[in-house]
Amino acid sequence: KTLVLGKEGESAELPCESSQKKITVFTWKFSDQRKILGQHGKGVLIRGGSPSQFDRFDSKKGAWEKGSFPLIINKLKMEDSQTYICELENRKEEVELWVFKVTANSDTHLLQGQSLTLTLESPPGSSPSVQCRSPRGKNIQGGKTLSVSQLELQDSGTWTCTVLQNQKKVEFKIDIVVLAFQKASSIVYKKEGEQVEFSFPLAFTVEKLTGSGELWWQAERASSSKSWITFDLKNKEVSVKRVTQDPKLQMGKKLPLHLTLPQALPQYAGSGNLTLALEAKTGKLHQEVNLVVMRATQLQKNLTCEVWGPTSPKLMLSLKLENKEAKVSKREKAVWVLNPEAGMWQCLLSDSGQVLLESNIKVLPTWSTPVQP
């Protein structure tokens, strides 16, 4: 008995070959002897029932001249899994068709961190093995149900599942979209008083995007976090529901999600967590955002530079007179110079690769007051 594997919804070709390699009479039947189709000597395909009943069954007329009389079954259904009989040249060929189906749990659009379950449906009597490969090369294998926990952004794309039965295989491709922000975290460095732009680009595109979101903010100086803004998303259009009075954030009306803080102030420095709940999805998308604020001031005979917010312990804060060596450099959040000489002073926040933030302050001769450009 020949075995053919098929995929639900696709086509299968069941072979039937003549030894004479020329056109001959043949008939395809179900195992209960009901006729499906055949050719009775006139080179015409004759179906065994009403067109509506047998419109999924066909043969390859072009192959008949070569002595090949396949049965083509289109739009395969699970119930097509059975034995088919090809009668030709006073012999009967039995062909077993097994139709398989691999589906993803409920939805192919899943949130980052959620689980993906892939389920194999197979005909009674079959004992297939299945292995699925993620777009990033992760292999999972097992029985009829395969699970991947903690989906990551790199898991977005085409998953390939190979079903193996009696040394024959059939391959399924399932497109999975992992819903996430492009970046898990970002840091914005600003001088006091500058406008701050926060952007939250998504790592996926869908036709319609509906949901609601909120930005919670933990200021470095505050004892608890507070909600800065809540918003709705309807068909990719953003509308603000509620915003705090201090600070009064502005939000862009289109994607990507975009927030503007009118000015960076020390009391706003800290970390935020933007959450986005999507319609018909359990769980939320998250993106962390951090704000570091720098202030340079001169009070009487003391020139001070300070930073607020979540900085790496490797960052260096320096005060230097323009075009001169740094007067003071510390891996701390505040530096100062007593009795600074007149000129343009620079406060610099640096790491190993660049100056992240710079603020200039002009120190006038002692009889004048300072000017901040």
């Epitope: 898990a184 975290s185 970002s186 840091i187 460095y189 951090n290 570091v292 900085t311 790496s312 312990p313 490797k314 960052l315 260096m316 320096s318 740094a326 450099s329 926040l349 640096s350 790491d351 190993s352 690769g353 660049q354 992240l356």
Partner: antibody, heavy 122, light 107 residues
Amino acid sequence: QVQLVESGGGVVQPGRSLRLSCAASGFTVSSYGMHWVRQAPGKGLEWVAIIWFDGSNKYYADSLTGLFTISRDSSKNTLFLQMNSLSLEDTAVYYCAREVALEGYYYYMDVWGKGTTVTVSS
Amino acid sequence: AIQMTQSPSSLSASVGDRVTITCRASQDIRNGLGWYQQKPGKAPKLLIYTTSSLQTGVPSRFSGSGSGTDFTLTISSLQPEDFATYYCLQDYNYPYTFGQGTKLEIK
């Protein structure tokens, strides 16, 4: 093509000094933090030192402070490691590496040289 | 200085296996951790930076996770070219420190 090539290794007696060089091509050392990392025969990697993009800051492994000095010459696009009072434990392959720093948050050594071998032996 | 403890020190596995290497910091390093691969006679190669960011050109079977003091490198399906020594590096603060390494061998 971004590349780092170390030189200056060799056999040296204990207590003596040696200066290693690392020539950079395809980028400028004055735009990146630059590291030295070493590996004793059959042992793991040991971080040695870093010099910042502007040369303003230098940091060393605790055990090497005062013995080794990291420096660079921007005009020659070259990194150096001056090693004084060498001991048998300083026998190793010395690698230089470039550090990428993004947003004051993401740091990584993405380009490494092939290494130069220093053997301290009496 | 921050101490990094890597485990196991050696590991035998087969092609196709899923492998996990862990690294523990002696204090909180947030997510200041990278993973490097080294083959005999060669310079180290960056795989993962800032705990979970995959370096460009590195196969996606490599992934990193963790935060604070406990970190993990996972190779989802071992390939013949993955047999090497792996090091974690804390770059949260100076002086930087490497883990002692994990030698991944063919079973």
